[in-house]
């Protein structure tokens, strides 16, 4: 296993609709054809997997149907979007990139993006 540098923004504020997007960029030492991207969430020392996708270079990222993540790739950059976030989901979101094929296997883990989420103000009831 060889190490690889992964860069991501330090802090992002999600939209009022609970959507946060950020770019995860990796310094690919070779010509990988198969890449796996995993988003981990760290909160109060607990690390959980948010979503993961394996893609072939030049193709779209495919997350599971029920995933809260979507993404696109361009060269050594992955543009990740996490949806359905609420204030309780505020935390550190870490991008993990694995170059699966061809060998050698490379692994890179970013420092994380602190995502802050605000629950939208409830709309006042309106009489019609």
């Amino acid at each position: 296993c060889k190490a690889m540098h992964v860069a991501q923004p330090a802090v992002v504020l999600a939209s009022s609709r609970g959507i946060a997007s950020f770019v995860c960029e990796y310094a690919s030492p070779g010509k990988a054809t198969e890449v796996r991207v995993t988003v981990l969430r760290q909160a109060d020392s607990q690390v959980t997997e948010v979503c993961a996708a394996t893609y072939m270079m030049g193709n779209e990222l495919t997350f599971l149907d029920d995933s809260i993540c979507t993404g696109t790739s361009s060269g050594n950059q992955v543009n990740l979007t996490i949806q359905g976030l609420r204030a309780m989901d505020t935390g550190l979101y870490i991008c993990k990139v694995e170059l699966m094929y061809p060998p050698p296997y490379y692994l890179g883990i970013g420092n994380g993006t602190q995502i802050y989420v605000i629950d939208p103000e409830p709309c006042p009831d309106s009489d019609f």
């Epitope: 330090a10 802090v11 992002v12 939209s15 950020f22 993006t113």
Partner: antibody, heavy 120, light 108 residues
Framework: QVQLVQSGAEVKKPGASVKVSCKAS????????ISWVRQAPGQGLEWMGW????????NYAQNLQGRVTMTTDTSTSTAYMELRSLRSDDTAVFYC?????????????WGQGTMVTVSS | EIVMTQSPATLSLSPGERATLSCRAS???????LSWYQQKPGQAPRLLIY???TRATGIPARFSGSGSGTDFTLTISSLQPEDFAVYYC?????????FGPGTKVDIK
Amino acid sequence: QVQLVQSGAEVKKPGASVKVSCKASGYTFTSYGISWVRQAPGQGLEWMGWISAYNGNTNYAQNLQGRVTMTTDTSTSTAYMELRSLRSDDTAVFYCARLTGATSHAFDIWGQGTMVTVSS
Amino acid sequence: EIVMTQSPATLSLSPGERATLSCRASQSVSSSYLSWYQQKPGQAPRLLIYGASTRATGIPARFSGSGSGTDFTLTISSLQPEDFAVYYCQQDYNLPFTFGPGTKVDIK
């Protein structure tokens, strides 16, 4: 080196608006947030809100909602804070500060402050 | 909103003495998100401690932070003349971010 440089002191009349700038240098502007903090004479620090330079999203302190607007110009690595409908109790030193997020979860770099005096 | 309280409001000590400043949060704050700042008259605040216990770049070893949950402490082991100032704790665990009211350390 990493620094935030703010615009100069302002004197405004009640009801007017003020726009303070904060120019960042020495780091990747869009990777971090900019918070604004004010300090009335002889008082403590009051957090006003922040802007995510990465996407321009903002979050304001409840008591300033509707009167404050925070923006960024990523082409010049500059953040702006505009406060409207000024009152005499808005007289304060306004600071911008870099929000580090993942790096250290703190306001690690501060501007030198901008004194705003509201007086008729 | 997480309310931060600090005690005492004022601490009167002599150079060379140990200063212990307390900060309490109204609800639990992950220690990664608790910071301490020093402010001298006419100057901008300066980051001293982040992550409850990690000294910021260039901060002398006489400053130390500790605590977890709702109770945090800043300790200055031996006060130097330049340490007389106001100290603020702050959380960025949850929005809105909040500061404590400050503790003034003055010369006895």
